[in-house]
Amino acid sequence: KVFGRCELAAAMKRHGLDNYRGYSLGNWVCAAKFESNFNTQATNRNTDGSTDYGILQINSRWWCNDGRTPGSRNLCNIPCSALLSSDITASVNCAKKIVSDGNGMNAWVAWRNRCKGTDVQAWIRGCRL
């Protein structure tokens, strides 16, 4: 599924991401835009053999199990396939674990490079939330 901007903002808010660990909703929508272009089925293979999955491009080295990443930790306790669902529940719950882990949203390279320090509220402007 490819979400609309406001559609994703509303879904993320309902899952409790707004101001989660101090990150406003705009940060999460911005991250999703530049990680996956709002596509729940996005996958990208990394040079280390791991793969990033879903709307927030969650990595199989640490966070989920795809059965093909050597030494996977699966810290979110889920199969990576769950992160590709049109239902963002698994991605949101895993993202909460990641952002609680110490580095906050810096764990997302796209957020660091494209969202951090910008007017992220623009990503939810005009949305009926």
């Epitope: 899952h15 409790g16 979110c76 889920i78 529940t89 719950n93």
Partner: antibody
Framework: EFQLVETGGGVVQPGRSLRLSCAAS????????MHWVRQAPGKGLEWVAV????????YYADSVKGRFTISRDNSKNTLSLQMNSLRADDTAVYYC?????????????????WGQGTTVTVSA | SYDLTQPPSVSVSPGQTANITCSGN?????GCWYQQKPGQSPLLVIY???KRPSGIPERFSGSNSENTATLTISGTQALDEADYYC??????FGGGTKLTVL
């Protein structure tokens, strides 16, 4: 078949302690948030506590905070509730229940597997 | 007192539609619904506002709008007579609604 079986209920005097246990089978226990819910005689359901798969995430109802402690042993597929400083208004059937969404982090989506309950009576 | 407000009772004739409401600020996130019959453990009938667990009949449906969740039972049957509880994302329950099938 998914199953939860609570044990440890009984009659206890006010101010004393009791420990409830819940044995889980039929599913990957470590992947799910687990709850305790109680129901006083003739009353509605009252959520008591939850522990998510990440054991740092434990939450309690205000009515039991500081008196009850929820814990889990994933190696034994067991959920526990340590109840201290018990009061008459803690008298209830205590249910353990599984969160419906696998690997929920700190947010309950509903409880889809319930035990049969164990009765706790706090009386002098 | 409860964070979520439900009507104490709702009556419906067999075959008709029953609507049970639940209101409260916590429902800006998700809500779910349980059925409980006397002497039995609760049964989840709706979660995440409108999802049905496997084994729950299609006549049970849910919605959530403007901080009010609604459980709808279409073509209500005598076996649907029970107490129904709503619940919010943080675990808190409503006070329960007794559904009577006349």
């Amino acid at each position: 078949e998914f199953q939860l079986v609570e044990t440890g209920g009984g009659v206890v005097q006010p101010g004393r302690s009791l420990r409830l246990s819940c044995a889980a089978s039929g599913f990957i226990f470590s992947s799910y948030g687990m709850h305790w819910v109680r129901q006083a005689p003739g009353k509605g359901l009252e959520w008591v506590a939850v522990i998510y798969y990440d054991e740092n995430n434990k939450y309690y109802a205000d009515s039991v905070k500081g008196r009850f402690t929820i814990s889990r042993d994933n190696s034994k597929n067991t959920l526990s509730l340590q109840m201290n400083s018990l009061r008459a208004d803690d008298t209830a059937v205590y249910y353990c229940a599984r969160d419906v969404v696998v690997a929920a982090f700190d947010f309950s989506y509903g409880m889809d597997v319930w035990g049969q309950g164990t009765t706790v009576t706090v009386s002098a | 007192s409860y964070d979520l407000t439900q009507p104490p009772s709702v009556s419906v004739s067999p075959g008709q539609t029953a609507n049970i409401t639940c209101s409260g600020n916590k429902l800006e996130k998700f809500g779910c619904w349980y059925q409980q019959k006397p002497g039995q453990s609760p049964l989840l009938v709706i979660y995440q506002d409108n999802k049905r667990p496997s084994g729950i009949p299609e006549r049970f449906s849910g919605s959530n709008s403007e901080n009010t969740a609604t459980l709808t039972i279409s073509g209500t049957q005598a076996l649907d007579e029970a107490d129904y509880y709503c619940q919010a994302w943080d675990g808190s329950f409503g006070g329960g609604t007794k559904l009577t099938v006349l």
